[in-house]
């Protein structure tokens, strides 16, 4: 460990969010997409 | 995401006093936590941080005076072992290493006789 | 220990105006970037402005604006509002997992 308390950076947590953002809206429309097909 | 602290009280000099900082949203395996105090009409003053790998640093003046500890998934204390009127002071705990990127609203301490 | 020297400790400046803020270490911040800046009004807790000693947090203004390395940093804030009233604080993060804020700079808005 480095980087010690560094490793929970902003930059890191960006990052971390706009995964978090990503992933939401992709499962989103993976399930909108299945109610709209039954 | 947020911090919340809690446990802030007046107290007598020399009596043990332990604040809670409580985080929502995201995992104390991954964050690291800091105690940071603000005397009325003074600066933020640094006491310490809990590491993601469960170490922990105090600012040299700190020292034997502080506790930090991590107490549960959503928890983080900071344990002053004996307080004086020098304490007083609003305490928040704020998430991030070497930068502080969410803080929580504060508690109030105040060490009086 | 490290020492982090904020100046001026007040300044004055009327709307639209620009204001400076420095901020220097007695020792070099980790990796020479870890200095940040936090605006603090009364009554309320700081806010994060700027990491790693010049890029804005999540929806802070680009009228904010951090600048600096190793020991010398620098907040400048342009075109001010009424609303940039306020305390302004750096922390920097050292080796050995230290942290240190400077002593704060008020700011008035005439």
């Known amino acids: 460990h480095s980087d010690g308390i560094f490793t929970d950076s902003y930059s890191r947590y960006r990052k971390q969010m706009a995964v978090k953002k990503y992933l939401a809206a992709v499962l989103g429309k993976r399930y909108k997409q299945r109610v709209k097909n039954k | 995401q947020s911090v919340e602290e809690s446990g802030g009280r007046l107290v007598t000099p020399g009596t043990p006093l332990t604040l809670t900082c409580t985080v929502s949203g995201f995992s104390l395996s991954s964050a690291a936590m800091n105690w940071v105090r603000q005397a009325p009409g003074k600066g933020l003053e640094w006491i310490g941080i809990f590491d993601p790998y469960s170490s922990t640093y105090y600012a040299s003046w700190a020292k034997g005076r502080f506790t930090i500890s991590k107490t549960s998934s959503t928890t983080v204390d900071l344990k002053m072992t004996s307080p004086t009127t020098e304490d007083t002071a609003t305490y928040f705990c704020a998430r991030g290493g070497g930068e502080f990127f969410i803080w929580g609203p504060g508690t109030l301490v105040t060490v009086s006789s | 220990a490290q020492v982090l020297t904020q100046t001026p400790s007040s300044v004055s400046a009327a709307v639209g105006g620009t204001v400076t803020i420095n901020c220097q270490s007695s020792q070099s911040v980790y990796k020479n970037k870890y200095l940040s800046w936090y605006q603090q009004k009364v009554g309320q807790p700081p806010k994060f402005l700027i990491y790693q000693a010049s890029n804005l947090a999540s929806g802070v203004p680009s009228r904010f604006k951090g600048s600096g390395s190793g020991t010398q940093f620098t907040l400048t804030i342009s075109d001010l509002e009424c609303d940039d009233a306020a305390t302004y604080y750096c922390?920097?993060?050292?080796?050995?997992?230290?942290?240190?804020f400077g002593g704060g700079t008020e700011v008035v808005v005439k």
């Open positions: 922390a920097g993060g050292y080796s050995g997992n230290m942290v240190d």
